[in-house]
């Protein structure tokens, strides 16, 4: 659900955290128009994710943790 | 009807651990999060960290990092907290609570609907 | 100390409207639903107010919520003695990447 570099919707699939690698905010006040989370999993996919829900928002705070574990 | 029902009271020594369980009746378990919240007495509520039974994986507030630990047994709809190296201040009340909608809901993000009947944990030498 | 603080008291009389703030910024309460729970003494809190001004079920119609920015507010209408309690606001932070309880205000009915 992106087009060029914005998400214009949200993933109707949950993403479970070991296929994920890393992440990037995408913010509406930015040049998008929608707020999002894009995940980058480990098949190179970019997944466009609702940055309310709550496995997005436990998904996102495991990859901070790990990056600062690095 | 969703219920949280928590293990019994605890007395600890200051260095010690302490675990506490959370069993859930009621209601699907593992696409739920569950967080744990403490309240010092007379203190207002601290989140703790949480988890989604599914994704096996917990998260932590940082100033807990290191000694907390929560799991998930999705075998018996349970939910645990483990605190180690138990200090005086970590003497309080300790609740686990589930939120409102499923791991996919956005507008409940956070809304802890049920809760337990809350752990009384005492840390004293 | 919390990140989103709201006054330590609040009170009024029976029938009065009492209306209880909370302050956060941009990457907590700017950002996401905002959630209020009410806490008798000696209970464990109770979910009032879910996605900034949704009642969950058995919630009377005198608790109402609103957002604005990067504050929320709880109003009691007509207010009565059993809603003399502790009121906590709440939100995700994204900047902390945790959820976050604001600093609680207890209302007095007098």
């Known amino acids: 659900a992106s087009n060029f570099d914005c998400c214009l919707g949200y993933t109707d699939r949950i993403l479970h955290p070991k296929f994920i690698v890393g992440f990037t905010r995408q913010l509406a006040n930015e040049g998008c128009d929608i707020n999002a989370i894009i995940f980058h999993t480990k098949k190179k996919l970019s997944v466009c994710a609702n940055p309310k829900q709550t496995w997005v928002k436990y998904i996102v705070r495991l990859l901070s943790k790990k990056v600062k574990n690095m | 009807e969703v219920q949280l029902v928590q293990s019994g009271p605890e007395v600890k020594k200051p260095g010690s651990s302490v675990k506490v369980s959370c069993r859930a009746s009621?209601?699907?378990?593992?696409?739920?999060?569950f967080s744990w919240v403490r309240q010092a007495p007379g203190q207002g509520l601290e989140w703790m960290g949480g988890?989604?039974?599914?994704?096996?994986?917990?998260i932590y507030a940082q100033k807990l990092q290191g000694r907390l630990t929560i799991t998930a047994d999705t075998s018996t709809d349970t939910a645990y907290m483990e605190l180690s190296n138990l200090r005086s201040g970590d003497t309080a009340v300790y609740y686990c609570?589930?939120?409102?909608?499923?791991?996919?809901?956005?507008?409940?993000?956070?809304?802890?609907?049920?809760w337990g009947q809350g752990t009384l944990v005492t840390v004293s030498s | 100390q919390s990140v989103v603080t709201q006054p330590p008291s609040a009170s009024g009389t029976p029938g009065q409207r009492v209306t209880i703030s909370c302050s956060g910024s941009?990457?907590?309460?700017?950002?996401?639903?905002v959630n209020w729970y009410q806490q008798l003494v000696g209970t464990a809190p109770k979910l009032l107010i879910y996605?900034?001004?949704q009642r969950p079920s058995g919630v009377p119609d005198r608790f109402s919520g609103s957002k604005s920015g990067t504050s929320a507010s709880l109003a009691i209408s007509g207010l009565q003695s059993e809603d003399e309690a502790d009121y906590y606001c709440?939100?995700?932070?994204?900047?902390?990447?945790?959820?976050?309880f604001g600093t609680g205000t207890k209302v007095t009915v007098l």
């Open positions: 609570a589930r939120e409102w909608g499923d791991y996919y809901s956005s507008v409940s993000s956070g809304a802890l609907h049920y």
């Open positions: 009621g209601g699907t378990f593992s696409t739920y999060a």
């Open positions: 988890i989604i039974p599914v994704f096996e994986t917990p």
């Open positions: 941009r990457s907590n309460i700017g950002s996401n639903i």
């Open positions: 996605s900034d001004n």
């Open positions: 709440a939100a995700w932070d994204d900047s902390l990447n945790r959820y976050v």
